[in-house]
């Protein structure tokens, strides 16, 4: 719970708590902003981002944005508040523990975005939804 000696007035978003009243700690995300990428035509890719940051705000989640146009492919990794749109899109999957890419309509490019809320979850971006159940370890759990 919020320690009594920690100041909690001044403004509303000073201290974010969960439903149990525990202080919500921020998560860790890959945070390389926009980088060129070789990720193409794969079921999943690693971000190849070497920077892991503590998100600035406890409510922020991890986001990855994959874009392909005639010139290049880029991968963007950031922290972002799911209450706010990113690249004009709502982060619908912010509560997901995995970063499952979903295609968004953007003129002149192929645009995929995912968001997730577990530590460094935007390090592994997944383009195939079946990928989750084709994981042998997961199948082992399911059939045990």
């Amino acid at each position: 719970t919020i320690p009594p000696h920690v100041q909690k007035s001044v403004n509303n978003d000073m201290i974010v708590t969960d439903n149990n009243g525990a202080v919500k700690f921020p998560q860790l995300c890959k945070f390389c902003d926009v980088r060129f990428s070789t990720c193409d035509n794969q079921k999943s890719c690693m971000s190849n981002c070497s920077i892991t940051s503590i998100c600035e705000k406890p409510q922020e989640v991890c986001v990855a944005v994959w874009r392909k146009n005639d010139e290049n492919i880029t991968l963007e990794t950031v922290c972002h508040d799911p209450k706010l749109p990113y690249h004009d899109f709502i982060l619908e999957d912010a509560a997901s523990p995995k970063c499952i890419m979903k295609e968004k309509k953007k003129p002149g490019e192929t645009f995929f975005m995912c968001s997730c809320s577990s530590d460094e979850c935007n390090d592994n971006i997944i383009f195939s939804e079946e990928y989750n159940t084709s994981n042998p370890d997961l199948l082992l759990v399911i059939f045990q």
Partner: nanobody
Framework: EVQLLESGGGLVQPGGSLRLSCAAS???????QMWWVRQAPGKGLEFIS?????????YYADSVKGRFTISRDNSKNTLYLQMNSLRAEDTAVYYC???????????????WGQGTLVTVSS
């Protein structure tokens, strides 16, 4: 009973250094994820550094990266924060905190020390 006791704060000039300590008791320190969190006057909490266990991986907020170093001595049940190249904007009460999952998805218990005041001023 879980106790966290910070020390090492004080007045320091810009560009100076300080080392904060957090003495832990009442739990198995060596297995816990530990944090340093600060609160500047009239501001919200800023989570500046985390150290995991086992493995001791460390993480930092952008605001302190390259200047602050978190470490732990499990044999002494103590968490440290080495602060170099201090700036006026580092003035805050510094808390050590521990967090662990409750077993219920997405919820955590957290414990906090009383804090130690760091003032950076010439």
């Amino acid at each position: 009973e879980v106790q966290l006791l910070e020390s090492g704060g004080g007045l320091v000039q810009p560009g100076g250094s300080l080392r904060l300590s957090c003495a832990a008791s009442g739990f198995t320190f060596g297995t816990e994820q530990m944090w340093w969190v600060r609160q500047a006057p009239g501001k919200g909490l800023e989570f500046i550094s985390r150290i995991d266990s086992p493995g001791g991986r460390t993480y930092y907020a952008d605001s302190v990266k390259g200047r602050f170093t978190i470490s732990r001595d499990n044999s002494k049940n103590t968490l440290y924060l080495q602060m170099n190249s201090l700036r006026a904007e580092d003035t805050a009460v510094y808390y050590c905190a521990k967090r662990r999952p409750t077993g219920v998805s997405g919820t955590f218990y957290d414990y906090w020390g009383q804090g130690t005041l760091v003032t950076v001023s010439s």
